[in-house]
Interface confidence: medium
């Protein structure tokens, strides 16, 4: 069961998973100037059996300037909806994740991948929060969030983490300081974690031959 919502936003904090539950999807996103190849995959899917889990499919990006004439498989549209994003932090190999049954490790990077990874989480997924550089963590409880199913609806538990503006960085176990500085961010996006939520659509019936798709992005 996919989690309906994004993990909670904590001011001056970002989250990541130490491992990904089977059923998790990772969109094949490409950096600016590149797009997915048609013969490639829409997403990677964490699949497996009781003894081993791995990512099904590989992501491939090609230059937007290069026409791709392969016509057999799914095209790879830019996906900015129903998505959970975590900043790519260089390099991320969470601790002990391979030993977790029913979970996949962080997928290796692919050529020309986007600066943010877009995951579709499933029920039972746990994500861990850390304060961004320049902020210190005041722990008042667990700094993690779990996607739970309650009364037929999914929800994320609220992490008890406050990040204060002191020049000190809280980090994940065994990790170096994050160095990511995602490129191409719209200026309006000021937090270090961008979770793109839903779009609103406004359609107007028009007595002309023109059909319009109007969307408004909001955070």
């Amino acid at each position: 069961e996919l989690c309906d919502d994004d993990p909670p936003e904590i001011p001056h904090a970002t989250f990541k998973a130490m491992a990904y539950k089977e059923g998790t999807m990772l969109n094949c996103e490409c950096k600016r100037g590149f797009r997915r190849i048609k013969s490639g995959s829409l997403y990677m899917l964490c699949t497996g059996n009781s003894s081993h889990s791995s990512w099904d499919n590989q992501c491939q990006c090609t230059s937007s300037a290069t026409r791709n004439t392969t016509k057999q498989v799914t095209p790879q549209p830019e996906e900015q909806k129903e998505r959970k994003t975590t900043e790519m932090q260089s390099p991320m190999q969470p601790v002990d994740q391979a030993s977790l049954p029913g979970h996949c490790r962080e997928p290796p990077p692919w050529e020309n991948e986007a600066t943010e990874r877009i995951y579709h989480f499933v029920v039972g997924q746990m994500v861990y929060y850390q304060c961004v550089q320049g902020y210190r963590a005041l722990h008042r409880g667990p700094a993690e969030s779990v996607c739970k199913m309650t009364h037929g609806k999914t929800r994320w538990t609220q992490p008890q983490l406050i990040c204060t503006g002191e020049m000190e960085t809280s980090q994940f176990p065994g990790e170096e300081k994050p160095q990511a500085s995602p490129e191409g961010r719209p200026e309006s996006e000021t937090s270090c974690l961008v979770t793109t939520t839903d779009f609103q659509i406004q359609t107007e019936m028009a007595a002309t031959m023109e059909t319009s798709i109007f969307t408004t992005e909001y955070q």
């Epitope: 069961e1 996919l2 999807m25 969109n27 797009r35 048609k38 829409l42 997403y43 899917l45 937007s64 300037a65 026409r67 791709n68 004439t69 016509k71 057999q72 498989v73 799914t74 095209p75 790879q76 549209p77 830019e78 996906e79 900015q80 909806k81 129903e82 579709h120 779009f199 659509i201 798709i213 109007f214 969307t215 408004t216 992005e217």
Partner: antibody, heavy 104, light 107 residues
């Protein structure tokens, strides 16, 4: 019948060149039919075999508009035509549709 | 082409009923299937993506399940505004294809 026609679909409020746009036909009283798709960034197109050679899908990214065009209309082209934004999870946003009526 | 077969083609139900619509694919489409609701004179609207993901803003009485070749859309407790036509769409393999639709009518 026999006339040419070009209908348009304008996208706004998102990065037009980085999303695929699909065209969908709905004949009177019938279901939805996926016609084809275009990537406005480079005008790469793919058609359903049922529509290949019958219509042309194009785009003008400078005005964030995609087009569906017929060179010679037939009575059987009478239908509602929708454009929709194609994302990994299907068709997330749809235009309100353009009704094309072909009569002699 | 992948053929999607919806069943039933039409269905009469009452407000409060639990309704299930099935979509079968002629070959496996993994979870690349979405569900749409269309009301007369209106454009379709997406309800479910990725076979089971609920579109934001869609009431939680709608749910989707399945993978591979068999998928279901369930409405747990029908409301008056739910009477419409429902379509499934596979977006796994070109050409993408819709099911023929299921018309849900008030009993």
């Amino acid at each position: 019948p026999g006339e040419s026609l070009k209908i348009s679909c304008k996208g706004s409020g998102y990065s037009f060149t980085t999303y695929w746009i699909a065209w969908v036909r709905q004949m009177p009283g019938k279901g939805l039919e996926w016609m084809g798709i275009i990537y406005p960034g480079d005008s790469d197109t793919t058609y359903s075999p049922s529509f290949q050679g019958q219509v042309t899908i194009s785009a003008d990214k400078s005005i964030t508009t995609t087009y569906l065009q017929w060179s010679s209309l037939k009575a059987s082209d009478t239908a509602m035509y929708y454009c929709a934004r194609q994302v990994a999870g299907g068709l997330d946003y749809w235009g309100q549709g353009t009704l094309v009526t072909v009569s002699s | 082409d992948i053929v999607l077969t919806q069943s039933p083609s039409s269905l009469s139900a009452s407000v409060g009923d639990r309704v299930t619509i099935t979509c079968r694919a002629s070959q496996a489409v993994r979870i690349d299937l979405s569900w749409y609701q269309q009301k007369p004179g209106k454009a379709p609207e997406r309800l479910i993506f990725g076979a089971s993901g609920l579109q934001r803003g869609v009431p939680s009485r709608f749910s989707g399940s399945g993978s591979g070749t068999e998928f279901t859309l369930t409405i747990s407790s029908l409301q008056p505004e739910d009477f419409a036509t429902y379509y499934c769409l596979q977006h796994n393999t070109f050409p993408y294809t819709f099911g023929q639709g299921t018309k849900l009518e008030i009993k």
